[in-house]
């Protein structure tokens, strides 16, 4: 047999499907590796061949397309399971070839079991909804191509284990689930079960996603520096430890690089020849607003250090702010016996 361009095991496509449900898997060759599509390949006389390696086996074997009720079939560049079984788990290979050309790629397929409340090892996509933002929708994902547009499936939506009906602010609308006004209480896993008929049989597609309610862009503000502020003065004697916290609140903003940093005399702390350390802690609210605290610490401060400018800066996609800490050298208290006595004219 002639040499075949082997693209190896494409781990990018970690395909997970539920047991006892239909699954349609496109050959990744045409989507990611070759410059032409299936129709072009087919009309050029190339044949698409499928085979697989069972889980925990090394032996490649052909896929049996002669199972009862055509349980596994191929249609153009799609491999169909109607439905899947647990032992269909394995690495699947699609190979495109003729007498002079050969190209193949493998991908892992995992058939996953779910319980009656749709819990499973399936990796769930996360959909973020803005809190109190008006009507927002989620759509039942990855159901295209399973049935023709002439077929009208029935769709049932669940939150966790419970069928969604007569919920206050969540309304099923076919393939969509509408949140009239998203609240923290709407956090959770939502499942759509799509039921459709095909050749006298009934099939179910189960799709679960996680909804996370986050801060709304309507309420988003530039970073707010709570500390340092004008009310606190960091008064130290040389030799003492100087600790200045910078505490910043960030509104939740999708894909924002929230940042806090200190400058000392306009430079980054690393560039100043003093022994300064900065430690940071981060906490999140339930709507993923963020509070960052960076504590600037100088173990043994000098009188020179107490004359420097310490500025905390913060930036998010909403803007940038800065606040200087009020740092000063503590005036030593008078020693009574010497200074005060002198004042009384003692000799």
């Amino acid at each position: 047999s002639e040499r075949c361009d082997d693209w190896g095991l494409d781990t990018m496509r970690q395909i997970q499907v539920f047991e006892d449900e239909p699954a349609r898997i496109k050959c990744p060759l045409f989507e990611h590796f070759l410059k032409f599509n299936y129709s072009t390949a087919h009309s050029a006389g190339l044949t698409l061949i499928w085979y697989w390696t069972r889980q925990d086996r090394d032996l490649e074997e052909p896929i049996n397309f002669r199972l009862p009720e055509n349980r596994i079939s191929k249609e153009k560049d799609v491999l169909w399971f109607r439905p899947t079984l647990l032992n269909d788990t394995g690495n699947y290979t699609c190979m495109l070839r003729n007498t002079t050309y050969c190209s193949k790629v493998a991908f892992p397929l995992e058939v996953v079991q779910k319980d009656s409340c749709f819990n499973s090892p399936m990796k769930l996509p996360v959909h973020k909804l803005y809190i109190e933002y008006g009507i927002q929708r989620i759509t039942c994902p990855n159901v295209d191509g399973y049935f023709p547009s002439s077929v009208k499936p029935t769709i049932t939506w669940y939150m966790g284990c419970y069928k969604i009906q007569n919920f206050n602010n969540v309304i099923p609308e076919g393939m969509n689930l509408s949140f009239l006004i998203a609240l923290i209480s709407n956090n959770g896993n939502y499942t759509c079960v799509v039921t459709y008929p095909e050749n006298g049989r009934t099939f179910h597609l189960t799709r679960t996603l996680t909804v996370k309610v986050v801060g709304s862009p309507k309420n988003a503000v530039p970073p707010v520096i709570h500390s340092p502020n004008d009310h606190v003065v960091y008064e130290k004697e040389p030799g003492e430890e100087l600790l200045i916290p910078c505490t910043v609140y960030f509104s939740f903003l999708m894909d924002s690089r929230n940042e806090v940093w200190w400058t000392i005399d306009g430079k980054k702390p690393d560039d100043i020849t003093i022994d300064v350390t900065i430690n940071e802690s981060i906490s999140h609210s339930r709507t993923e607003d963020e509070t960052r605290t960076q504590i600037l610490s100088i173990k043994k401060v000098t009188s020179e250090d107490l004359k420097r400018s310490y500025v905390c800066h913060a930036r998010s996609a909403k803007g940038e702010v800065a606040k200087a800490a009020k740092v000063k050298q503590k005036v030593p208290a008078p020693r009574y016996t010497v200074e005060l006595a002198c004042g009384f004219g003692a000799t």
Epitope: E259, V260, W261, E280, I282, Q294, R315
Partner: antibody, heavy 119, light 107 residues
Amino acid sequence: QVQLQESGPGLVKPLGTLSLTCAVSGGSISNSNWWSWVRQPPGKGLEWIGEIYHSGSTNYNPSLKSRVTIALDWSKNQFSLQLRSVTAADTAVYYCARYGSGPFGGDYWGQGTLVTVSS
Amino acid sequence: DIQLTQSPSFLSASVGDRVTISCRASQGISSYLAWYQQKPGKAPKLLIYAASTLQGGVPSRFSGSGSGTTFTLTISSLQPEDFATYYCQQLNTYPFTFGPGTKLEIK
């Protein structure tokens, strides 16, 4: 003095996964810095791949986002890059770097490691 | 993405010369710009951050200026070790992008 050192295979097959590690010494990856990856194809300019904050939050170049993962390993004081489904266009010198927050730029860099994608 | 254009692409100069390299951003980036020096086979080295602040340990003959969309790196008196390629990088907006580089050669 902070030092960064990349390690990983110098040759990766097309469609394989490029995996590199950056060991950090002389400082902790728990400090408030962004740990970044930058690459440079032979004879070409620099391209920012992405970054991870000490808290684990990541940002990626959209041109690579679907294929890239950057992760931290606090116990080993190192961070890693995984680039999946590589092609010849991913052949480059890969650098790890430490970036400060805000406008501070990349102040510490590894020496770079050449990764060639070829069968 | 924000595009950075550097000019000139190539620059021939002599030891002792004063040289300036320009970096222009396709949109405003405030002062979120860094300058790097790279020698063949070596990693980039940070020279300037925040458009005009000299990185610790970098000779004072290097200086940076500019804000918004137009930035300049100046070397006041070229030394033999300064012949290298210089890159600007914007740190304002994702993805962070680099300029195409300016190669500084000995005349």
